[in-house]
């Protein structure tokens, strides 16, 4: 017979990414052969839902299936038809369903039940929805980018995949940001720790990985912004409040219910003579910075070293990815390269910062007002974090890599979730098989 | 031969129950969805019922005019799909057909001879 | 609910005619249209999946054409044996629903 290549057979999964801000669809593929090999899963594609995160459909829940169609279609498109039944489909919620199910645990069961339901509708192998903890965040996260960077393999490479990838096995923490929470997760040197909590044990392919992690529950960039607010208009002598974190000549009215309406701004709650207030805009990095930091309560550790909050943090260990917000942010600013040092970052946000709004507005005229107003405070906020909150430094600030897309497919914990639950990661090393996936015969 | 074989047919009062049963042979049958549909003078043919698999959580899903009166069940080490039918109507009345779809999904390539149901007082 | 509607209700036809069963859906469901055959006293029969994917053991003078909300079911050269009702099929989502049919019958 002809010598004629068999057709590939490929695998597809489906994971929704529902933040607190949006819900993103992640289309992955693999050679069904190959699925427990590493590396071998990749993003065909990403929808992001038009809207905002279901927690926001709390009050009508009956807009959630249209609010789903769009990216489910797209999903039913990009997806040959023969494998729709066969493709698994999970929904993860993160921290704005946590706060959702803090607030009331009925409404939020409400919410994933008509999520449930609309998804079920579809030709696909529904597997559930549920909220995720931050510790399963932050682990599918760790997971993901070593996945991808190919820290688990057991072939050491002679090329580099990434620009920042190194030869060796050493894995790479992560750091992500989302709206409503922020993760920080890494293999740190001492394999002993403080506390169980923040220890996870794994073993993937024939190695055991001893793994600190710890999910920042609104301290994601959106939270972190209501609660300075929160804190800030406390002091406030009216109901006009100086911010330096936003761009000089900004304006914007912000309703006190509101401001009130998240969980994480209960600790500076207050009966306040006014239901509005405004916030005037005075673009100043360094106060900016000053008002960020009294978030971060540091003045009580029971632990050898901590974050913050009285949250234990080992001795930073290695290279680190920071993805999601810390990305989409740095990057929006141009301060993604490895060249550029933790000091000209802040030289750069002072800059930036103190630039009046209507020449933001005018450099920026293609993005939405709403996210282009708030940069100034999410840079400020990214340094406090990393700087104040994890303690990296200038020296060590050349460890953290801005991440995007690794080979393609999106920096997060979704990868890292479908792996897991499609038991493609084998605890131990597979044995190598003869054949690659081209077969001929 | 791929084949589906209805029962349990008859004439029932309104608000009486009754159950259907379908017995597949000739396919495996516990990796395919099953469906029921429907057919009357008045209203045409009429999709039912829809029960996916096992590794799906046994899923079901059903037509707005019967949710939460009719229960579509199956037993995959009997081959068997099942449709229980409760507080029945007039409009209920028809030709009750067991049907699958052995080549992707959402249309009928296989279906049974049909039970006859009668809701009349 | 997808609507699907047809025409005509009924067709009178002469054995050899070329022959056309108009089918449309109240939104676009791509190419999620199926077509049944109901001889009278029978079951009906899959006749063309995903509006013009024939099916093993039918006729190849049934085809199909359409895609988005209208779709249409061809008989290149009527036979005899082809009277009965023809209906569309939503396959795109649930509720899947039915066309009304269209009586095929021999003037």
């Known amino acids: 017979t002809q010598n004629k290549a068999l057709p590939e057979n490929i695998k597809y999964g489906i994971v929704l990414d529902a933040g607190s801000s949006h819900t993103s669809l992640y289309i992955y593929k693999w050679p069904a052969e190959k699925e427990n090999d590493t590396g071998v899963v990749h993003q065909v594609e990403e929808c992001r839902v038009k809207g905002p995160g279901i927690s926001k459909y709390v009050q009508k829940v009956n807009e959630i299936g249209i609010y789903l169609t769009d990216c489910m279609e797209r999903a039913r498109e990009v997806i040959p038809r023969s494998q729709h039944q066969e493709t698994p489909v999970y929904l993860g919620a993160t921290a704005g369903m946590r706060l959702l199910r803090m607030e009331s645990e009925e409404l939020a069961d409400r919410v994933l039940d008509v999520v449930e339901r609309s998804l079920s509708n579809y030709p696909f192998d529904f597997q559930g929805a549920r909220i995720i903890t931050g510790q399963e965040e932050g682990a599918y996260g760790w997971i993901t980018i070593n996945y991808l960077l190919g820290k688990f393999s057991q072939k050491t490479r002679w090329f580099s995949i990434v620009p920042y990838e190194t030869n060796n096995q050493e894995t790479f923490g992560a750091l992500d940001l989302g709206g409503a929470s922020t993760q920080i997760t890494f293999v740190p040197q001492n394999q002993t720790t403080e506390s169980p909590d923040n220890a996870l044990q794994f073993r993937l392919y024939g190695k055991d990985y001893n793994v600190y992690t710890h999910s920042f529950l609104c301290y994601g960039k959106d939270q972190a912004l209501w609660q300075k607010l929160a804190k800030d208009i406390q002091v406030a002598s009216n109901e006009i409040l100086r911010d330096p974190c936003f761009h000089p000549g900004y304006k914007k009215v912000v309703n006190v219910s509101d401001l009130y309406k998240t969980p994480c701004t209960k600790r500076f709650e207050m009966t306040l003579p006014f239901q509005q207030f405004e916030i005037q805009g005075i673009g100043n990095y360094q106060q900016c910075h000053q008002s960020v930091l009294e978030l971060f309560n540091t003045s009580y550790c029971p632990y050898s070293q901590c974050a913050f909050n009285g949250i234990f943090l080992p001795p930073l260990q290695g290279d680190f990815g920071a993805f999601s917000a810390f990305y989409f942010v740095m990057n929006f600013l141009n301060l993604t390269s490895e060249k550029v040092s933790q000091e000209k970052v802040t030289e750069m946000m002072k800059k930036f910062c103190s630039q009046p709004w209507e020449e933001i507005k005018t450099s920026y005229a293609g993005v939405k007002e709403k996210y282009l107003s708030e940069y100034c405070f999410s840079g400020t906020y990214i340094l406090s974090l990393l700087l104040q909150g994890y303690h990296f430094t200038a020296d060590s600030w050349e460890h953290i890599h801005f991440i995007g897309k690794i080979q393609g497919s999106d920096a997060g914990w979704t990868l890292g979730y479908m792996l897991n639950l499609t038991n493609m990661i084998p605890a131990e090393q597979p044995l190598s098989t003869p054949l690659s996936h081209s077969t001929y015969v | 031969e791929v084949k589906l074989e209805e029962s349990g047919g008859g004439l029932v009062q309104p608000g009486g129950s009754m159950k259907l049963s379908c017995v597949a042979s000739g396919f495996t049958f516990s990796k395919y969805w099953m469906n029921w549909v429907r057919q009357s003078p008045e209203k045409g043919l009429e999709w039912v019922a829809e029960i996916r698999l096992k590794s799906n959580k046994y899923g079901t899903h059903y037509a707005e005019s019967v949710k939460g009166r009719f229960t579509i069940s199956r037993d995959d080490s009997k081959n068997n799909v099942y449709l229980q039918m409760n507080n029945l109507r007039p409009e209920d009345t028809g030709i009750y057909y067991c049907?699958?779809?052995?080549?992707?999904?959402?249309?009928?390539?296989?279906w049974g001879a049909g039970t006859t149901v009668t809701v009349s007082s | 609910d997808i609507v699907m509607t047809q025409s005509p209700a009924i067709l009178s036809v002469t054995p050899g005619d070329r022959v056309s069963l108009s089918c449309r859906a109240s939104?676009?469901?791509?190419?999620?249209l199926h077509w049944y055959q109901q001889k009278s006293h029978e079951s009906p029969r899959l006749l063309i999946k995903?509006?013009?994917q024939s099916i093993s053991g039918i006729p190849s003078r049934f085809s199909g054409s359409g895609s988005g909300s209208n779709f249409t079911l061809s008989i290149n050269s009527v036979e005899p044996e082809d009277v009965g009702v023809y209906f569309c099929?939503?396959?795109?989502?649930?509720?899947?629903?039915f066309g009304a049919g269209t009586k095929l019958e021999l003037r």
């Open positions: 099929q939503n396959g795109h989502s649930l509720p899947l629903t």
């Open positions: 939104q676009s469901i791509s190419d999620y």
């Open positions: 995903y509006a013009s």
């Open positions: 049907t699958t779809q052995l080549d992707l999904y959402w249309f009928f390539d296989v």
